[in-house]
Interface confidence: low
Amino acid sequence: MMTGTIETTGNISAEKGGSIILQCHLSSTTAQVTQVNWEQQDQLLAICNADLGWHISPSFKDRVAPGPGLGLTLQSLTVNDTGEYFCIYHTYPDGTYTGRIFLEVLESSVAEHGARFQIP
């Protein structure tokens, strides 16, 4: 039975040219996290494997940095980075937990952070 929940940074905004940290946190479970995938709907950004460490997709190597922790830092943001991002926690023995973050990259200098929320 999957008892865990994923807490994410929720809906967030950032300025064009800046950077943002995408973070998810798995709680309420004793399952072992074997791997975390960071993805957009159509692309794999990065993998953090418990044994093999980090792998950043070649097309994102210049703009994506691993961490902090199991999170992911996106740099040199463009308006095209606006969209959904998913943290996919592969765990044993529970299975897979997915968290969703929506990032809006703004042209203006006003970028407010949204509230945190949970996905069961």
Epitope: Q40, Q41, D42, Q43, L44, E84, F86, T98
Partner: nanobody, 122 residues
């Protein structure tokens, strides 16, 4: 209801080749990154290869680079794994995995196939 079904596994001699297929069926709006995992007896499940919606390859585990090729047919929602120069260490159950979105309002849900056995004899 979404189903992932693998095929193409079997028994092969070392140095041989196999092509695995995984077909996603059901109510599918879009299938994002699709992946092949494998699990050998007594070992942790490991990601072998992944491929993005646009066909760009996101990842190969080091031990299969240059020997395995992942590809996909978006029109049919099928992902393939072409395996050549197979080694006994490649023996495992190979499982297909994808985050499949069934409607625009929900996040993609993680789906798994049941797996297909690949046995490489020396």
């Amino acid at each position: 209801q979404v189903k992932l079904e693998e095929s193409g596994g079997g028994l092969v001699q070392a140095g041989g080749s196999l092509r695995l297929s995984c077909a996603a069926s059901g109510s599918i709006l879009s299938a994002g990154v699709m992946r092949w995992y494998r699990q050998a007896p007594g070992k942790q499940r490991e990601l072998v290869a992944s491929i993005a919606l646009d066909g760009s390859t996101g990842y190969y585990i080091d031990s299969v680079k240059g020997r395995f090729t992942i590809s996909r047919d978006n029109a049919k929602n099928i992902v393939y794994l072409d395996m050549r120069s197979l080694e006994p260490a490649d023996t495992a159950v190979y499982l297909c995995n994808a985050n499949i979105r069934t409607d625009m309002r929900s996040a993609p849900f993680d789906h798994w196939g049941h797996g297909t056995q690949v046995t490489v004899s020396s």
